[in-house]
């Protein structure tokens, strides 16, 4: 390329026209701040191609760089560009306008940059300050470019005297940006929805100021794109968060959402996925089972737990005998249903110190406009066995009788058994046990009844013993699955003149 | 010097219109977003309206949507606020401002504050 | 819309004095907060913008504080020239709010 005049740096008359030409051996062109102005092109007879920009009524505004470049580039040397600045010394016009993306200069390390305030004329003297500061700063100046140095994170001004007016240049503002390794987290206000209700999922980065979000979800893949919102409503700076929000979801919407962010400076990344469910309508579905019969201890406390999911959230009874159950004043019930996670919830019913009315049906129900599912059980009150009565009688058919009675729930069971050596019974000799059939010694007769209003049943055992020729220590064991009582009593001899 | 020059406050009737400018010395003007404050007699600066450099945005307070049009002459280094169906309580002085948006990074926006100030002028609303 | 809360309304204190005036935003704002100061009759005059960062040609005795939603401007060691009426302003989404004043005044 061929440049006349060939420069690198002019100066021209403020009002007077130039022409500046540019020739190659292939289209050329020139160029202004990226654009192309008005210029004629021609290609001669030799074929060499050539542009001519005429600047008419120059002023003030017309400094600064001129490029010439091929036309087309393809084939040829991508350096081949000539560079040419021109000043136009004009005192109407002080420092050189800049748009915003001069004024603001964001860095992310410590460089060098430079403060953009150029001037008309190169014989000017341009000084750089802090704005509002008097004291001229010592950094190089550069009339093509600027001042070339390292700054703090401040407003800088430069300042020029054109005649005898002192004319400053707009505030550059200087700011350091933040920036670090990418560590994105997303989430979901909902991972399960219905359809037409709303998707809302957040995107949040830490520690940048410089990121850009990327989101790509089901509807995307279809053409249907949704713009996110990118806010800042942490509790810190530089927790930058995009929102993804889809009204009125709908079937195909369920699938895999990703966010990925980039940080352009030092080319870091990072992304994240969630998975959203859209479901046609709300459902709730037992988990686990739960047997038809569910048992307590008198007086204990004691917890019925169900764990189910649902989704939406639903409403949860409980019933006992037909009878809606709510937290009672005194304490005696207490009913919670949690959130474990999104969809799954624990519903419990606690009976504090458990007493026998508690016994009966109970029913647990979760619900919501969409479905329904209950689940049902028996609760029986398990009461330790106490031996209520031992006594020992002579009937006049000449054998002797132990009466045990005693009551439990469930059913308790009866042992009979007996000690002949008083002295080293029960702790050296094992006592026998009682009631065998087979033994005519003894016989054994044991009614159970049931009362329904206590809940619990009630065991009468009577012993008859046939030959009792010496003292004799029987004992009447009741056990069931909640525990044993025992008691025992001294059998005599209908010879012996007394009992004990 | 940079300076930012008032005029066009005066008295008008309820219903009235009036318009407001600001015109700008000292620093390029197209560069930057522009903002209206107004402070009520005794009160607290309240936040109007505000224009982006070629005008492409701008925002309104709540309580004069509709009624209130911000707009920019960048040739004249302008700014205005046109204001219709004026109220007793839109009785203020009125500061235009000069509003330090840089343009955003990536997907995160700065904001450096409101620098440089007109000296307000007085629109009274009142029958 | 984000509402500013200032306190106290009204500071008494005297030349030499620390004082500190409190800014809270209804919902987190990051770092997007300017103080100013005006005297009557005057325009605002920029003191701290982003929270922290202290505008060319205000004295250093001025500082701002706090992130999210509570902010703190500090005059360390008033002189006469301070007292004023401060106003905290945030910047949101192109919106802007002044939070109410603190007259900052004479004890």
């Known amino acids: 390329l061929v440049v006349t005049p060939p420069g690198p740096e002019l100066v021209l008359n403020v009002s007077s026209t130039f022409v500046l030409t540019c020739s190659g051996s292939a289209p050329v062109v020139w160029e202004r701040m990226s654009q192309e102005p008005p210029q004629e092109m021609a290609k001669a007879q030799d074929g060499t191609f050539s542009s001519v920009l005429t600047l008419t009524n120059l002023t003030g505004l017309d400094t600064g760089e001129y490029f010439c470049t091929h036309n087309d580039s393809r084939g040829l040397e991508t350096d081949e560009r000539k560079r040419l600045y021109i000043f136009v010394p004009d005192p109407t016009v002080g420092f050189l306008p800049n748009d915003a993306e001069e004024l603001f200069i964001f860095l992310t390390e410590i460089t060098e940059i430079t403060i953009p305030c150029r001037v008309t004329d190169p014989q000017l003297v341009v000084t750089l300050h802090e704005k509002k500061g008097d004291v001229a700063l010592p950094v190089p100046y550069d009339h093509q470019r600027g001042f070339s140095g390292i700054f703090e994170d401040r407003s800088y001004i430069c300042k020029t005297t054109i005649g005898d007016r002192e004319v400053d240049s707009d505030a550059y503002y200087v700011y350091r940006l933040q920036v670090s390794s990418i560590n994105v987290s997303v989430n979901a206000v909902q991972t399960v929805v219905r359809q037409g209700e709303n998707i809302t999922l957040m995107c949040i980065v830490i520690g940048n100021e410089v990121v850009n979000f990327e989101w790509t979800y089901p509807r995307k893949e279809s053409g249907r794109l949704v713009e996110p919102v990118t806010d800042f409503l942490l509790d810190m700076p530089y927790h930058i968060r995009s929102i993804l929000h889809i009204p009125s979801a709908e079937l195909e919407d369920s699938g895999t959402y990703t966010c990925n962010v980039t940080e352009s400076v030092n080319d870091h990344q990072d992304e994240k996925a969630i998975n959203i469910t859209v479901v046609e309508s709300g459902y709730v579905r037992l988990l686990g089972e739960v047997g038809t019969l569910q048992f307590a201890e008198l007086h204990r406390s004691r917890t019925l737990q169900v764990v189910f999911e649902a989704y939406p959230p639903p409403t949860v009874l409980w019933f006992k005998d037909n009878r809606t159950l709510g937290d009672s004043s005194a304490g005696e019930i207490a009913l919670s249903t949690r959130n474990v996670s999104e969809t799954r919830y624990v519903s419990e019913l606690t009976l504090v110190r458990v007493k026998v009315a508690e016994a009966g049906h109970y029913t647990m129900r979760a619900f919501h406009e969409d479905a329904e599912v209950q689940l049902s059980f028996q609760l029986q009150i398990n009461v330790p066995v106490r031996v209520l009565e031992l006594s020992e009688s002579h009937p006049d058919s000449g054998e002797q009788t132990v009466r045990c009675r005693g009551r439990g729930m469930p059913q308790p069971n009866i042992i009979w058994s007996a000690c002949r050596d008083l002295k080293r019974c029960p702790r050296e000799l094992p006592p026998t046990l009682l009631g065998n059939s087979s033994e005519e010694e003894s016989q054994l007769e044991t009614n159970v009844t049931y009362w329904e209003e206590e809940q619990e049943f009630e065991v009468v055992s009577t012993l008859r013993l046939q030959h009792v020729d010496r003292p004799l220590s029987v004992r009447c064991t009741l056990r069931n699955a909640v525990g044993q009582d025992t008691q025992e009593v001294i059998v005599v001899p209908h010879s012996l003149p007394f009992k004990v | 010097e940079v300076q930012l020059v008032q005029s066009g406050g005066s008295l008008v009737q309820p219903g009235g219109s009036l318009r407001l400018s600001c015109t700008a010395s000292g620093f390029t003007f197209s560069s930057y977003w522009m903002s209206w404050v107004r402070q009520a007699p005794g009160k607290g600066l309240e936040w109007v309206a505000n224009?982006?450099?070629?005008?492409?945005?701008?925002y309104y307070v709540d309580s004069v949507k509709g009624r209130f049009s911000i707009s920019r002459d960048n040739a004249k280094k302008s700014l205005y606020l046109q204001m219709n169906s004026l109220r007793a309580e839109d009785t203020a002085v009125y500061f235009c401002?000069?509003?330090?948006?840089?343009?955003?990074?990536?997907?995160?926006?700065?904001?450096?504050?409101?620098?440089?100030w007109g000296q307000g002028t007085l629109v009274t609303v009142s029958s | 819309a984000i509402r500013m809360t200032q306190s106290p309304s009204t500071l008494s204190a005297s030349v030499g004095d620390r004082v500190t005036i409190t800014c809270r935003a209804s919902?987190?704002?990051?770092?997007?907060l300017a103080w100013y100061q005006q005297k009557p009759g005057k325009a605002p005059n920029l003191l701290i913008y982003k929270a922290s960062s202290l505008e060319s040609g205000v004295p250093s005795r001025f500082s701002g504080s706090g992130s999210g939603t509570e902010f703190t401007l500090t005059i360390s060691g008033l002189q006469p020239d301070d007292f004023a009426t401060y106003y905290c302003?945030?910047?949101?989404?192109?919106?802007?709010?002044f939070g109410q004043g603190t007259k900052l005044e004479i004890k």
């Open positions: 224009i982006q450099q070629d005008e492409s945005e701008k």
């Open positions: 919902q987190s704002i990051s770092d997007w």
């Open positions: 401002a000069r509003d330090l948006v840089p343009p955003r990074q990536g997907d995160y926006y700065h904001y450096f504050g409101m620098d440089v």
């Open positions: 302003q945030q910047y949101n989404s192109y919106s802007r709010t």
